[in-house]
């Protein structure tokens, strides 16, 4: 994400996703996102966050897990897991509130 200099200090993060422009990116924080789409294996993406920090507070579900951190390359060696499959009555929503 392009970030204006006035938006505070930037951190350098590992970038590993189909949309990365290089091996690292700079942002307000670092991210790891683990996503499992229907009928596919989970995919882990690493990158930078600049907007909607509230996603960092969302609890893991069987489909997605968001992780955020604030130091240099802090997302490099992080491995995430998804919640175990739950019965429909127990399923947590993905809403980050």
């Amino acid at each position: 994400d392009p970030v204006k200099p006035s938006r505070g200090p930037l951190v350098t993060c590992t970038c590993e996703s189909p949309h990365c422009r290089g091996p690292t990116c700079q942002g307000a924080w670092c991210t790891v996102v683990l996503v499992r789409e229907e009928g596919r294996h989970p995919q882990e993406h690493r990158g930078c966050g600049n907007l909607h920090r509230e996603l960092c507070r969302g609890r893991p579900t069987e489909f997605v897990n968001h992780y955020c951190c604030d130091s240099h390359l802090c997302n490099r060696n992080v491995s995430l897991v998804l919640e175990a499959t739950q019965t429909p009555s127990e399923q947590p929503g993905t809403d980050s509130q």
Epitope: K4, T31, H52, E54, L55, H66, D95
Partner: antibody, heavy 118, light 108 residues
Framework: QVQLQESGPGLVKPSQTLSLTCTVS??????????WNWIRQHPGKGLEWIGY???????YYNPSLKSRVTISVDTSKNQFSLKLSSVTAADTAVYYC??????????WGQGTTVTVSS | ESVLTQSPGTLSLSPGERATLSCRAS???????LAWYQQKPGQAPRLLIY???SRATGIPDRFSGSGSGTDFTLTISRLEPEDFAVYYC?????????FGQGTRLEIK
């Protein structure tokens, strides 16, 4: 360039569920740079944010609508959708989808009018 | 939740004049994520300004944004006939995203 197009029924009966889809063309919905939003505008009124979804499927909703709103994403179809349950006449509005990044909501659909009436 | 209050509600000016629109937030806007949009009847909103002061692609330089913290301003230096519309400010730094109630800019 990226374009958004809303689609769905223009008339919904009270107590039913409003369902709309936004189709993204000219770009990937799976980019981590963007958040995909729904906004509505009641006749003659201002803009009301409904909620957003990230490519991961994570969502955030307007607290005033949270109990009735579900936003979902289908990355294989490059679409995201809005469901609003238990509608009343107060949900009659123009519904817009929009792409958001650090550069604001830079791409909007043209809007679709939904009327709630029996 | 950050409540945005725009003033004035209606602004009556003539082409060629300078327009100053105000937006006040109930709490400091996160990371300067404040935007301005223009909306004409029957059309979707159009992004004018993002990040307080950056012009969106294709926006003429007569539009400028300024401010910080809780007080923001959209200035149109010399009004053209096509500028008469409704203008909304928006904070998008943290959720819930909120819009101001709008300022209607009408021809005097």
């Amino acid at each position: 360039q990226v374009q958004l197009q809303e689609s769905g029924p223009g008339l919904v009966k009270p107590s039913q569920t409003l369902s709309l889809t936004c189709t993204v063309s000219g770009g990937s919905i799976s980019s981590g740079d963007y958040y995909w939003n729904w906004i509505r505008q009641h006749p003659g009124k201002g803009l009301e944010w409904i909620g957003y979804i990230y490519y991961s499927g994570s969502t955030y909703y307007n607290p005033s609508l949270k109990s009735r709103v579900t936003i979902s994403v289908d990355t294989s179809k490059n679409q995201f959708s809005l469901k609003l349950s238990s509608v009343t006449a107060a949900d009659t509005a123009v519904y817009y989808c929009a792409r958001e990044s650090t550069d604001g909501m830079d791409v909007w659909g043209q809007g679709t009018t939904v009327t709630v009436s029996s | 939740e950050s409540v945005l209050t725009q003033s004035p509600g209606t602004l009556s000016l003539s082409p060629g004049e300078r327009a100053t629109l105000s937006c006040r937030a109930s709490q400091s806007v996160s990371s300067s994520y404040l935007a301005w949009y223009q909306q004409k009847p029957g059309q979707a909103p159009r992004l004018l300004i993002y990040g307080v002061s950056s012009r969106a692609t294709g926006i003429p330089d007569r539009f400028s944004g300024s401010g910080s913290g809780t007080d923001f301003t959209l200035t149109i230096s010399r009004l053209e006939p096509e500028d008469f519309a409704v203008y909304y400010c928006q904070q998008y730094g943290s959720s819930p995203i909120t819009f101001g109630q709008g300022t209607r800019l009408e021809i005097k």
